[in-house]
Interface confidence: low
C-alpha cells in the first residue's frame, strides 16, 4: 500500500502510521538513503541466510520464467490540495531473494524523470524471505507547475517495473491567461475585450467590471468575451474570475477614446537662408491615435491681412519641414497643424521668421575691355546693375579674366569693391585671347556672371577687343 | 460599399517606369487613405506607400528613390508610380484602405522582362 | 530595418483552436502598431481580418479575434474550418511604414 499526506513537519520513518507492506519484522529498522537515480542495496544483515545482493544458484532462462511476478504495491491514485501546502507520497515493492539483479526506484513526471533537487528519499526493509523497497518523495509549498503525474520505475532482472501514476492536482486561486487589453477606440464605436482564467479548480466565471461596477449580472464561462456596444468618454475595464477557491481581479485597463490631436507646440526656426527656412515643432498629444501628417502654414508678415496662406504638407516624423520658395529678405508668419484619423488639430501659436538676403538676380551691364599697351594693362569697365531691396546690400564684384594661348591656360579672379565701376588688371600673357565676365556680390551671395567679353592681346601694338555683349537698352558706344 | 480596382500594364521592360492606377468607389479620397502593396509570385505581402486624407505621403525606406505615389481627388484616383523597373519587381501590386487592411482590390500582375 | 516573424506554418483539426503571433524585432506590440490580420488563399487577392489589434472588419465571423499576447500580437481562430485553410499574414505599423509578416500557412487536417 501507500499513503500521501499534508504535513507540517515530520520525520521520514514515522511518516507511515500503519503496518509496512510486505512481510517487516517488529524489530527491524530500515536502512535510508537518499534518492539518487539509480540506488544500489543496502549490504546484508547478519543470520541471512541468502542476502538479496549476495549470489545465488544459477538459474535457467527456462526456470528465470518461472520466478513469481514482481511489481509495484497499489498505492493512492489521486492527491488534491492547495496551493502552497506541503504533500508526501510514495511507492514500495517488495524483493524476493530469488531476483539477482536489482537497480534502485527512480521517480518520473509526466514521463521525464525527475533528476537533481527533488526532495526523495528511499528506504530498505529486508527480511528472510527478501527486501521491501520504499520510495518517499515530498514536495514543500506545491506550486501549479508541481501539477501532473507522478510514478515510479526500477529494473528487476533487466525487467523494467512501473508504478501505477500517483496524479496530483494543485488547486488554487483563478490564473490568468489572457486579460482584457488597453485599447483606443473610436467614439460610439463596438469594440471587444477577452478574458481567460484557469484552475484548477473547474470551472472558472467571470464578472466584467466597468469604472468599478460589474457590466453582467451573471457569470460567464471562462473564457469570456465583453462586446462593448461603444464608449463616448473614457473607461476602465477589468474582469474577476471566480472559482471555488475565491476571487482574482485582472488589472484595469484604460480604454481611450480617440480625438483630434492636440497643436503642436514649441515652433522654432532652426535655419534662415534666402529663399528656405527650416522650421520644427513638438507635436501635440496624438489624440490616442497616430498622427498621420502634419500641415505647415505660411503668410507674409508684411501683407495686410488678406495675405494669402501657403500650405505645406508633410509626413507626421520627423518634426521639421524646410519651407522652400519664399522670397529672400522677407517676414512671414508660421504656425503648424497635425492629423490624425480623427481629424486636423488646431494651429500651434504663430511664430515670427524672416528669409535673409538674396544674392543679386542680374548681371552688372555695359562691359568694356581696353588694352593699354604704354602701362601693359587691360583697363575694365561696367554699369552697376539693378539691384533690388531683397537682394542685399552691394558690397562689391567679381571679375574673372581667363587667358588663353597655344599651350597656355590661366584662370584668375578679383574682387573689388563696391565704389567705382572699372578696375584694372595686369596683362598676364601676350599674343593670347583674354575673356572677361562680372558678377555683382551682396551679403547674400554671388549673383549670375556678365555675358563674356573678349580681347586679343597682340605680340605688338596691335589690338582688338569684342565689345560688352550686355549694353544697357539704347547704349552703342564703342571704342 | 467601398471597392478598389487597380489599372496599369501587364508587361514592362527593365529600366521603364511602371504606372499604375487604383480608383475608388463608395467612398471620398478626402476621407479614406490609400496604401500600395506588393506581393512577387510565392512570396510574402511588401508595403510600397501610403497617400493620406490631406495629400501626404510615406514610403518604404528601401524603395523611395523609385517611388512616387499621388492622388485625384476629383477622379477618385490613386496613382503609383516606379521607376527604373528590374525583373525582381515582378509581382502582383494591389491597393488597400490604409488603416484597416480590410478593403483590398483584385492586384494587377506585372511582369517585367525584356 | 524592422522585421516581423510569423510562424512559418500551423496545423489545426477541424473545429480546433489555433492561435498564430506576430513579433516584431523592435520589441513588444502595442495597441500604436495597429496590428492588422490578412487571410490569402491561393490566387486570390488577400482578405481584411483584423485591425487595429482586435478590430474585426465587416463580415468577418467571429471565430475570428485579435489581441496582444504577452509581447505579440495574436489571432485566434476558434472553431476551426476547412476553408480556414489559407496563408495569413500580419502587418505592424512603425510611425510610417507598414512592415508585414512573412506569413503563416495554416493547414486544416483531415
Known amino acids: 500500500g501507500g499513503t500521501a499526506e499534508k504535513w507540517e513537519e515530520t520525520e521520514l520513518d514515522q511518516l507511515f502510521s500503519g503496518p509496512l507492506p510486505g512481510r517487516l519484522p517488529v524489530n527491524h529498522r530500515p536502512f535510508s538513503a537518499p534518492h539518487s537515480s539509480r540506488d544500489q542495496l543496502p549490504p546484508p544483515q547478519t543470520g541471512r541466510s541468502h542476502p538479496a545482493h549476495t549470489a545465488a544458484p544459477q538459474v535457467t532462462s527456462t526456470a528465470s520464467k518461472l520466478l513469481p511476478p514482481v511489481a509495484f504495491n497499489h498505492t493512492i491514485g489521486h492527491i488534491v490540495l492547495s496551493e502552497h501546502k506541503n504533500v508526501k507520497f510514495n511507492c514500495s515493492i517488495n524483493i524476493p531473494n530469488t531476483y539477482q539483479e536489482t537497480a534502485g526506484i527512480s521517480w518520473w513526471k509526466d514521463g521525464k524523470e525527475l533528476l537533481g533537487a527533488h526532495h526523495s528519499i528511499t528506504q530498505f526493509y529486508p527480511d528472510e524471505e527478501g527486501v521491501s523497497i520504499i520510495a518517499l518523495f515530498s514536495i514543500a509549498s506545491v506550486q501549479r507547475s508541481d501539477n501532473g503525474s507522478y510514478f515510479c520505475k526500477m529494473k528487476v532482472n533487466n525487467r523494467e517495473i512501473v508504478s501505477d501514476p500517483i496524479y496530483v492536482e494543485v488547486q488554487g486561486l483563478p490564473y490568468f491567461i489572457k486579460q482584457p487589453e488597453s485599447v483606443n477606440v473610436t467614439r460610439n464605436t463596438a469594440f471587444n475585450l477577452t478574458c481567460q482564467a484557469v484552475g484548477p479548480p473547474e470551472p472558472v466565471n467571470i464578472f466584467w467590471v466597468q469604472n468599478s461596477s460589474r457590466v453582467n449580472e451573471k457569470p460567464e464561462r471562462s473564457p469570456s468575451v465583453l462586446t462593448v456596444p461603444g464608449l463616448t468618454e473614457t473607461a476602465v475595464f477589468s474582469c474577476e474570475a471566480h472559482n471555488d477557491k475565491g476571487l482574482t481581479v485582472s488589472k484595469g485597463v484604460h480604454i481611450n477614446i480617440k480625438v483630434i490631436p492636440s497643436p503642436p507646440t514649441e515652433v522654432h526656426i532652426l535655419n534662415s537662408t534666402a529663399h528656405s527656412i527650416l522650421v520644427s515643432w513638438v507635436p501635440g498629444f496624438d489624440g490616442y491615435s497616430p498622427l498621420q501628417n502634419c500641415s505647415i502654414q505660411v503668410k507674409e508678415a508684411d501683407r495686410l491681412s488678406n495675405g494669402s496662406v501657403m500650405v505645406f504638407n508633410t509626413s507626421a516624423s520627423p518634426h521639421l519641414y524646410e519651407i522652400q520658395q519664399l522670397q529672400a529678405l522677407a517676414n512671414y508668419s508660421i504656425a503648424v497643424s497635425c492629423r490624425n484619423e480623427i481629424g486636423w488639430s488646431a494651429v500651434s501659436p504663430w511664430i515670427l521668421a524672416s528669409t535673409t538676403e538674396g544674392a543679386p538676380s542680374v548681371a552688372p551691364l555695359n562691359i568694356t575691355v581696353f588694352l593699354n599697351e604704354s602701362n601693359n594693362i587691360l583697363d575694365i569697365r561696367w554699369t552697376k546693375p539693378p539691384i533690388k531691396r531683397q537682394d542685399g546690400e552691394l558690397v562689391g564684384y567679381r571679375i574673372s579674366h581667363v587667358w588663353e594661348s597655344a599651350g597656355t591656360y590661366k584662370e584668375l579672379s578679383e574682387e573689388v569693391s563696391q565704389n567705382g565701376s572699372w578696375a584694372q588688371i595686369p596683362v598676364q600673357i601676350h599674343n593670347a585671347t583674354c575673356t572677361v565676365r562680372i558678377a555683382a556680390i551682396t551679403k547674400g551671395g554671388i549673383g549670375p556672371f556678365s555675358e563674356p567679353v573678349n580681347i586679343i592681346i597682340p605680340e605688338h601694338s596691335k589690338v582688338d577687343y569684342a565689345p560688352s555683349s550686355t549694353p544697357a537698352p539704347g547704349n552703342t558706344d564703342s571704342m | 460599399q467601398v471597392t478598389l480596382k487597380e489599372s496599369g500594364p501587364v508587361l514592362v521592360k527593365p529600366t521603364e517606369t511602371l504606372t499604375l492606377t487604383c480608383t475608388v468607389s463608395?467612398?471620398?479620397?478626402?476621407?479614406?487613405?490609400i496604401s500600395w502593396i506588393r506581393q512577387p509570385p510565392g512570396k510574402a505581402l511588401e508595403w510600397l506607400a501610403v497617400?493620406?486624407?490631406?495629400?501626404?505621403?510615406d514610403y518604404n525606406s528601401a524603395l523611395k528613390s523609385r517611388l512616387t505615389i499621388s492622388k485625384d481627388t476629383s477622379k477618385s484616383q490613386v496613382v503609383l508610380t516606379m521607376t527604373n523597373m528590374d525583373p525582381v519587381d515582378t509581382a502582383t501590386y494591389y491597393c488597400?484602405?490604409?488603416?484597416?487592411?480590410?478593403?483590398w482590390g483584385q492586384g494587377t500582375t506585372v511582369t517585367v522582362s525584356s | 530595418q524592422t522585421v516581423v516573424t510569423q510562424e512559418p506554418s500551423f496545423s489545426v483539426s477541424p473545429g480546433g483552436t489555433v492561435t498564430l503571433t506576430c513579433r516584431s524585432s523592435?520589441?513588444?506590440?502595442?495597441?500604436?502598431?495597429?496590428a492588422n490580420w490578412v487571410q490569402q488563399t491561393p490566387g486570390q487577392a488577400p482578405r481584411g481580418l483584423i485591425g487595429?489589434?482586435?478590430s474585426r472588419a465587416p463580415g468577418i465571423p467571429d471565430r475570428f479575434s485579435g489581441s496582444i499576447l504577452g509581447n505579440k500580437a495574436a489571432l485566434t481562430i476558434t472553431g476551426a474550418q476547412a476553408d480556414d485553410e489559407s496563408d495569413y499574414y500580419c502587418?505592424?505599423?512603425?510611425?510610417?511604414?507598414?512592415?508585414f509578416g512573412g506569413g503563416t500557412k495554416l493547414t486544416v487536417l483531415g
Open positions: 497617400i493620406w486624407t490631406g495629400g501626404g505621403t
Open positions: 487595429g489589434a482586435n
Open positions: 502587418a505592424l505599423w512603425f510611425s510610417n511604414h507598414w512592415v
Open positions: 488597400a484602405s490604409h488603416w484597416y487592411l480590410d478593403v
Open positions: 463608395g467612398i471620398s479620397l478626402s476621407s479614406f487613405a
Open positions: 523592435t520589441g513588444a506590440v502595442s495597441t500604436s502598431n495597429y
